[in-house]
């Protein structure tokens, strides 16, 4: 029986958002933790592990041409990672040798509960997000943004760090989750797939999105990120789902028009300063909301979720700039660059407006079969 | 309390070779992509070239094949192997550490090429 669709309103104009529905009618549910339909074959969404992708989907090689303080985690796993004796409980850095986060890759060895013991830990991201069991909280205010129109100068830094494009941003991007839940904007990076394949992180009734973008706040109760790590709280992430639109979108296109300049993994280049929050739906007042953890390595957790209900548009040709420009490790295309869905072990996702309520005219009733649980604290 | 302390710089002649250090404390340097950056008389700091976490590396077009950028991680050491230099390498060197969403950079060390 299919799950009701999010509830349906005509998208807010402006910006460069997109559908406020995010799902097709073709879209299935699926059930927590089982393979989706759009995953790489073979992956199994078990805990702490990443996509592994069948032969046909392995990236490209590339042509051979001339030529990554004391971190605090807490939430560590209790389970064991296969093949491994049991790690220490309270320090995802054992020592220097022993828990190297510099070698983790997508698909494939090391396992990432081995690169870090935390991406073996119960409260992982990225996650299923099933809207009929999501809890409305009204206490879940619009989100604030403040500062992210930037100037031209000075310019930003957009680097191809062999796992993504990744954007710095400057001091003085503050986001607020509600009052006394204050976090500044560092940096924003995007996960995608391959031609014809989705590549978002979080999947919607096991729906995955063709790309997803990150937008990685600080508490403004902490100095730095690894002072920051695995408190609860202590990082924010604002995302949101990428899909394929009739129109360029012109936010977007001052990034990836400058892709080829980055083609090459550890290459940067310098890029205007832009509206940070066009790159963003333009409604921030419906969304999802649960507590996670980092999708890569160090997989801390304590993470703040926010997961726009309203998508972004992209051209076709966008999209396909944007998983068919940059190379990664060992001479291969950075693709696929997602890890797989997470269980949910018990957590709830949050709703800052009715999701569970389907719009049709067949919904008598509505039913929400989770209730808030702390919202807003 | 991060810190990066460079050195290595000084006075070399056209053609010469300098190897310039980049020795991280506070930080857990191994996850950490590690660049240098320069800046020379008269214009803003550039990028000279960056090793990710994972080793790969990358030079930008002006010194690919004169320079080579490397790392140890078990000495939480950047170095930058600087061949064949020309007057217009001369600059200030700086150490970049990015990781997520910190970032954290060097006082620098000059670089003079000069007969």
């Known amino acids: 029986q299919r799950l009701p669709r999010m509830q349906e309103d005509s998208p807010l104009g402006g910006g460069s958002s997109g559908e406020d529905d995010p799902l097709g009618e073709e879209d299935l549910p699926s059930e927590e933790d089982s393979p989706r339909e759009e995953d790489p074959p073979g992956e199994e969404d078990l805990p702490g592990e990443e996509d592994l992708p069948g032969e046909e989907d392995l990236p490209e090689v590339k042509p051979k041409s001339e030529e990554e303080g004391s971190l605090k985690l807490e939430d560590l796993p209790t389970v064991e990672a296969p093949g491994d004796p049991q790690e220490p409980q309270n320090n995802a850095h054992r020592d220097k040798e022993g828990d190297d986060q510099s070698h983790w890759r997508y698909g494939g060895d090391p396992p990432w509960p081995r690169v870090s013991p935390a991406c073996a830990g119960r409260f992982q991201s990225p996650v299923d997000i099933r809207p009929q069991l999501a809890a409305f909280c009204p206490a879940l205010r619009p989100l604030e943004l403040l500062g992210f129109q930037l100037p031209p100068l000075p310019e930003l830094r957009l680097r191809n760090n062999g796992h993504s494009v990744q954007l710095t941003l400057p001091p003085g991007l503050e986001m607020a989750l509600g009052p006394g839940r204050e976090y500044r904007a560092l940096q924003l990076h995007l996960h995608w797939g391959a031609a014809g394949r989705p590549g978002s992180e979080h999947t919607v009734e096991g729906h995955r999105f063709p790309a997803e973008i990150h937008v990685v706040h600080l508490s403004t109760a902490f100095a730095r990120v690894d002072e920051a790590l695995g408190r609860p709280g202590g990082l924010a992430v604002l995302a949101a789902f990428l899909e394929e639109g009739p129109e360029e979108n012109s936010a977007y296109e001052q990034l990836l028009s400058r892709l080829e300049e980055i083609a090459e993994e550890g290459s940067e280049t310098q890029v205007p300063g832009l509206d940070i929050s066009a790159l963003l739906p333009s409604d921030f007042s419906r969304y999802f909301q649960y507590e996670g953890s980092l999708t890569t390595p160090p997989c801390a957790q304590g993470v703040i979720w926010t997961v726009f209900n309203q998508t972004v548009m992209l051209s076709a040709k966008q999209l396909h700039t944007l998983s068919d420009t940059l190379w990664g490790p060992g001479d291969s295309r950075l693709q696929l660059n997602f890890r797989a869905t997470q269980p949910l072990n018990g957590r709830v996702i949050e709703a800052s407006f009715p999701a569970g309520v389907d719009s049709s005219p067949r919904a008598a009733e509505p039913v929400q079969l989770n209730s808030c649980l702390a919202a807003g604290d | 309390q991060v810190q990066l302390v460079e050195s290595g710089g000084g006075l070399v002649q056209p053609g010469g070779s300098l190897r310039l250090s980049c020795t991280a404390s506070g930080i857990i340097f191994s996850v950490y992509d590690m660049g240098w950056y320069r800046q020379t008389p008269g214009k803003q700091r550039e990028f000279v070239a960056r090793?990710?976490?994972?080793?790969?590396?990358y030079l930008t077009d002006s010194v690919k094949g004169r320079f080579t950028i490397s790392r140890d991680n078990s000495k939480n050491t950047l170095y930058l192997q600087m061949n064949s230099l020309r007057a217009e390498d001369t600059g200030v060197y700086y150490c970049?550490?990015?990781?997520?969403?910190?970032?954290?950079w060097g006082q620098g060390t000059l670089v003079t090429v000069s007969s």
């Open positions: 090793i990710t976490a994972g080793g790969g590396t």
């Open positions: 970049n550490a990015a990781w997520i969403g910190d970032d954290y």
